[in-house]
Amino acid sequence: EPPTACREKQYLINSQCCSLCQPGQKLVSDCTEFTETECLPCGESEFLDTWNRETHCHQHKYCDPNLGLRVQQKGTSETDTICTCEEGWHCTSEACESCVLHRSCSPGFGVKQIATGVSDTICEPCPVGFFSNVSSAFEKCHPWTSCETKDLVVQQAGTNKTDVVCGPQDRLRA
């Protein structure tokens, strides 16, 4: 009876279990009744980081100096290259695909501390009663407009991203 499932580090093909290729190698040909799986090492600047049946290795990430990137850790046949930013610059994401001088704070957040040469911008959520409707690297959260001081009433409540909307008070008719 042909197998319906295979052991760990194997895969099912043509009703038989074949060995997966180890990390750093790609699949050349599936096993047969008479032969083992054939695998080949990844080439220079290529990698595969799992037991696999891939027919092509992945290209190492390129740390583009035009984007402010440099190599933090050179890739191997089993690992991708890790990029980082030039000194004084900050990665825009965990994957570090581009660099910014300093982070900006999104709407709903204000700048707690402006970036310096050694530390990035520190953002903080706008508390109740304050808002920020912009991305900024220097603006703090702004207080909601006080409708009462303008002899107006709140027509629309504020949020962490929007100011309150003030309007005239309803006059009671006699």
Partner: nanobody, 116 residues
Framework: EVQLLESGGGLVQPGGSLRLSCAAS???????EMWWVRQAPGKGLERVS?????????YYADSVKGRFTISRDNSKNTLYLQMNSLRAEDTAVYYC?????????WGQGTLVTVSS
């Protein structure tokens, strides 16, 4: 393609004044917070001044407060930095930058030298 072209730098004596300009293109200038950042010889980048998109709110580093004034003309897509009472420690290459400060979106800068 974002382009920022700084100009107005030069050699000036201590106590003198200069006005830097930054001509912006390749993006909607009026939508972006803009900054002036400087780099003194052998030093890191220092954030000097910033202005919000409408030109109504500004930031100044303590080292330039009361001496420098940032402004913008959204109809001309231009950012300015008026620098008065210049000191030797203001000597640097001055760059303008737009949020979110991508490395590849920086200009060449303009050199300001304060010396007698």
């Amino acid at each position: 393609e974002v382009q920022l072209l700084e100009s107005g730098g030069g050699l000036v004596q201590p106590g003198g004044s200069l006005r830097l300009s930054c001509a912006a293109s390749g993006f909607t200038f009026r939508d972006y917070e803009m900054w002036w950042v400087r780099q003194a010889p052998g030093k890191g980048l220092e954030r000097v001044s910033a202005i919000n998109p409408q030109g109504t709110r500004t930031y100044y580093a303590d080292s330039v407060k009361g001496r420098f004034t940032i402004s913008r003309d959204n109809s001309k897509n231009t950012l300015y930095l008026q620098m008065n009472s210049l000191r030797a420690e203001d000597t640097a290459v001055y760059y303008c930058a737009k949020l979110p400060f991508f490395f590849q979106e920086w200009g060449q800068g303009t050199l300001v030298t304060v010396s007698s």
